[in-house]
């Protein structure tokens, strides 16, 4: 489970916390009495903010209110203004801008083309029985499995736009129903948030920067996880997304078949027909369950055909029966001739890559699937790089002016909603939420943007990314436009629903508090950031995937007890913090659990020992290795042989954060551990408290 911060009233400084502390008590204790408590003593303690009881046991106090890690540091703007450029600089800048615009349009074109090819690839990969497989198989009828497929695919392709486009292509190819696609879209929303979390790891060198950056990145994760946690069961029960989007799409009155608008296909067809062409007649025959079509290849071979009013007739007993002497032959077994029925004589082959390969449909489809995915990802990356280079320098100034400034009272509350619009707009421009949020992450880390302001920007980004899905829908052929547009709208309304759940009322902004809690833990135990990433984006989805494939019985058998334990822990946690007196004394805190179950300190010792031998070798390599080492072992002093780690060590020495005085502790076990009375981890692996 993700670390769960205190769910009570938000305090001005929620990072002043005790990790692994007991439940909060309403009355303040006598400090002198508290220091004399034994391990098993249960007594009222000071009301303070808490992180989950199973998080780290080490206690830190931020130096002063001025040095609050969640406060923004002073920033210096960089970037040459237009007015400050000389004539040569202005001309160069202008032509660079034109060049970037051309490149941008080019990559956008190939992006749309790759969507078209992706649709063809799914038709080929799906093969003759694809429709039945996707509509009947457990993979598509199990929403939980759909969800984790969405997460894993998006984690692998590093873009929700790409995985959403895949789903849209599958829907437009009729390989997937809208209902089955919705959980995949939800999973894609979760998966895309890994990108900016990875970006946040790059700021591991500076503890306070890392705290802010990691929290800023994981606010996206928590929003998506919480949204799915609530909305997936709601969707499974009510199908509200499917119903709403169906009503909207039907109100557009799209025509089916040939008369439907091809829109982007008009400009993409000249390119896509050079890659692959499908025999539309075979596709329609398969759709109508034509048995003869099952042995036919979907890849179009002959484009130029001569239509003659004759047809091959295998029933000619001998060549003497030929209707036309010149159009008569044998294949050694049967005699053929042309009858007075339309017959297409193949004259010229199609001019596409796969025309002469004679590969099975599955092979062609797989090749195209991989290539179109690569092009999709590549185009998205290049679009972002181009836009990134355009925005570089001026982005900090623009963001600080537009985002961190509140409207005057009484309209201050509207600022967040403007931030949502800005986030949506920016993502609409860059065509990728992961890119926009990844750009935000270092800005949060260095203090350009507060987490409170980054949160609505991220939510807006989730809305903005749906425009890519709408683009994908518009690239679908006319008769598939409705279904693909519907799935794009499902993505849109899912994000809207999530915003309505976790934004309008300040109390419901759980993702901020959860992200800050995780930021604090990861700043203290930096290896936990990697652990979190692996658990939430790989292990949990893969476990659910495995259990789902094993069947509903296995999934329920394992899932129900796990969910029950989680709910039990949460309820107990809530009671401990709200009304501990209703609980038996033993359950008023977590001391009844062994230390490894309620603190990260023992785990830290294990990780430190495990990475001990790796640290010295790794740190001597380069700055990147050093940062990776420091992330894992949380110990810059272990890297003395590396100049970069010495620099880090020196920088940290001037910023050491004092450990809280034992009299403020609400738990003697933790108090003693901090003072060294209780055996903790090996001191050799603990170089510094922070």
């Amino acid at each position: 489970m993700a670390p769960w911060p205190e769910l009570g009233d938000a305090q001005p400084n929620p990072d002043k916390y005790l990790e692994g502390a007991a439940g909060q008590q309403p009355t303040a204790p006598d400090k002198s009495k508290e220091t004399n408590k034994t391990d098993n003593t249960e007594a009222p303690v000071t009301k303070i903010e808490l992180l989950p009881s199973y998080s780290t046991a080490t206690l830190i106090d931020e130096p002063t209110e001025v040095d609050d890690p969640w406060n923004l540091p002073t920033l210096q703007d960089s970037g040459i203004k237009w007015s400050e450029r000389d004539t040569k600089g202005k001309i160069l800048c202008f032509f660079q801008g034109i060049g970037r615009l051309i490149l941008l349009l080019g990559f956008l074109y190939f992006f749309v083309c790759s969507l078209d090819i992706l649709s063809s690839a799914f038709q080929l990969v799906g093969g003759k029985m694809a429709g039945q497989f996707f509509s009947n198989s457990s993979i598509m009828s199990n929403p939980l499995l759909g969800l984790v497929i969405g997460v894993l695919v998006t984690v692998l392709v590093q873009s929700s736009s790409t995985s959403t486009s895949i789903v849209v292509s599958m829907v437009s190819s009729s390989l997937l129903t809208v209902r089955a696609a919705i959980p995949i879209i939800m999973g894609a929303n979760i998966g895309t948030s890994i990108t900016n979390t990875i970006v946040a790891l790059m700021q591991v060198g500076d503890r306070s920067e890392f705290r802010r950056a990691f929290a800023g990145a994981t606010v996206h994760d928590f929003f998506n996880w919480l949204s799915v946690l609530v909305l997936l069961p709601v969707e499974v029960a009510t199908h509200y997304l499917e119903i709403i989007t169906q009503l909207i799409v039907e109100s557009f009155h799209f025509k089916n078949g040939e008369d439907a608008p091809d829109l982007l296909k008009v400009i993409t067809k000249p390119f896509t027909k050079l890659i692959v062409q499908l025999d539309k007649k075979v596709i329609s025959q398969i759709a109508m369950n034509d048995e003869k079509a099952k042995n036919k290849s979907l890849v179009k071979i002959w484009c130029k055909t001569f239509t003659n009013k004759t047809q091959i007739n295998v029933t000619v007993p001998s060549t003497a029966n030929c209707t036309s002497p010149s159009l008569c032959w044998t294949d050694g077994i049967q005699n053929w001739t042309m009858k007075n029925v339309t017959y297409k004589e193949n004259i010229a082959k199609c001019q596409h890559i796969f025309v002469n390969f004679h590969l099975p449909d599955l092979a062609v489809g797989t090749i195209l699937l991989i290539l179109s995915l690569l092009v999709l990802c590549g185009c998205l990356i290049m679009i972002v790089k181009i836009l990134g280079s355009v925005l570089k320098g001026q982005v900090a100034t623009v963001i600080k002016k537009t985002i961190n400034t509140d409207f005057p009272f009484p309209f201050a509350w509207l600022t967040g909603y403007l931030a949502i619009l800005v986030g949506a707009g920016m993502t609409f421009i860059v065509q990728s939420s992961s890119v926009f949020t990844s750009a935000l992450t270092p800005l949060i880390g260095i203090g350009v943007i507060t987490i409170e302001r980054a949160y609505p920007l991220t939510l807006g980004s989730n809305i903005g990314t749906t425009t890519t899905a709408i683009l994908a829908a518009l690239a679908s052929p006319g008769n598939a436009l409705r279904s693909s547009l519907q799935i794009a709208l499902c993505h849109f309304f899912f994000n809207i629903s999530g915003i309505l759940l976790w934004y309008p009322i300040p109390f419901t902004r759980l993702p901020i508090r959860m992200a800050k809690g995780l930021g604090n833990i990861s700043a203290k135990y930096r290896w936990f950031a990697v652990f979190y990433l692996i658990i939430f984006f790989f292990l949990i989805p893969l476990t659910v995937f495995g259990l789902s494939l094993a069947g509903w019985r296995v999934l329920v058998g394992v899932g129900v007890p796990v969910v029950f334990i989680i709910i039990l822990v949460l309820c107990l946690r809530l009671l401990q913090s709200r009304c501990p007196r209703v609980l038996p004394k033993k359950l008023q805190n977590w001391n009844f659990l062994p230390l490894w179950m309620r603190s990260l300190k023992p785990w830290d010792a294990v990780v430190s020992k495990f990475t001990g031998c790796f640290q010295m070798r790794c740190c001597c390599c380069c700055r990147v290795c050093c940062r990776a080492c420091c992330l894992l072992c949380d110990c810059p002093k272990c890297c003395r042989c590396s100049k970069c780690c010495e620099d880090l060590e020196e920088a940290q020495e001037g910023q050491d954060v004092p450990v809280k005085a034992p009299e403020t502790f609400d738990n003697i076990t933790i108090s003693r551990e901090a003072q060294g009375e209780v055996p903790a981890s090996d001191s050799k692996t603990e170089c510094t408290a922070l």
Epitope: V314, T319, T330, D331, I333
Partner: antibody
Framework: QVQLVQSGAEVKKPGSSVKVSCKAS????????IHWVRQAPGQGLEWMGG????????NYKQNFRGRVTITADESTSTAYMELSSLRSEDTAVYYC?????????????WGQGTTVTVSS | DIQVTQSPSSLSTSVGDRVTITCTAS??????VAWYQQKPGKSPKLLIY???TRHTGVPERFTGSGSGTDFTLTISSVQPEDVATYFC?????????FGVGTKVEIK
């Protein structure tokens, strides 16, 4: 790519029989006719017969009827040619070749050939 | 059975020369004629089908023509790699029959 891989060379005694296999890959086996053609040393090509794998319809050249049997196994995409009552004049290289069913494109791909030597 | 006669049985030419091989069927075969190339020690390869349609990947220097009973294969500019035996085949009626072959050599 399109491949027709034939079995190895055989040395047989007169009166015995030989079975040559031809494994197809890189195309839809059932969409093609598999023909067998032989070439005696220093001679031209002689068509022996063929089979349509998806319905097992066969046809043989008159002078081979009763002596040759052509079969096909769809599951393994393999065609077989069995020639019985071997004589010394049956010493030749035996080729399998494919022909697109319902097309007049002739034998567009051939196997590498199997040398059958008949000697006492 | 339709008899297919090929001429000449062999010919010697120089690189760059134009070569014409003829094939005569004992009866009208329409355009149901194919041409094959067999290099020494190799299996035959299809060059031309339906009398004049060049098979995929066949160089443009190879052209086929004719209908009825008389057919020709022309190599417009002979290359060293064209050293082979060329066979014509009729597929108007069963059994399929081949010509005896024309061996092309380079001087």
């Amino acid at each position: 790519q399109v491949q027709l891989v034939q079995s190895g060379a055989e040395v047989k005694k007169p009166g015995s029989s030989v079975k040559v296999s031809c494994k197809a890959s890189g195309f839809f086996f059932t969409e093609y006719i598999i023909h067998w053609v032989r070439q005696a040393p220093g001679q031209g090509l002689e068509w022996m017969g063929g089979i349509i794998p998806n319905n097992d319809v066969t046809n043989y050249k008159q002078n081979f009827r009763g002596r040759v049997t052509i079969t096909a196994d769809e599951s393994t995409s393999t065609a077989y040619m069995e020639l019985s009552s071997l004589r010394s004049e049956d010493t030749a290289v035996y080729y399998c070749a494919r022909w697109r069913n319902a097309y007049y494109s002739a034998m567009d791909s051939w196997g590498q050939g199997t040398t059958v030597t008949v000697s006492s | 059975d339709i008899q297919v006669t090929q001429s000449p049985s062999s010919l010697s030419t120089s690189v760059g020369d134009r070569v014409t091989i003829t094939c005569t069927a004992s009866q009208d075969v329409g355009t149901a004629v194919a041409w094959y190339q067999q290099k020494p020690g190799k299996s035959p390869k299809l060059l031309i089908y339906w009398a004049s349609t060049r098979h995929t990947g066949v160089p443009e220097r190879f052209t086929g023509s004719g209908s009825g009973t008389d057919f020709t294969l022309t190599i417009s500019s002979v290359q060293p790699e064209d050293v082979a035996t060329y066979f014509c085949q009729q597929y108007r009626t069963s059994p399929l029959t081949f010509g005896v072959g024309t061996k092309v050599e380079i001087k």
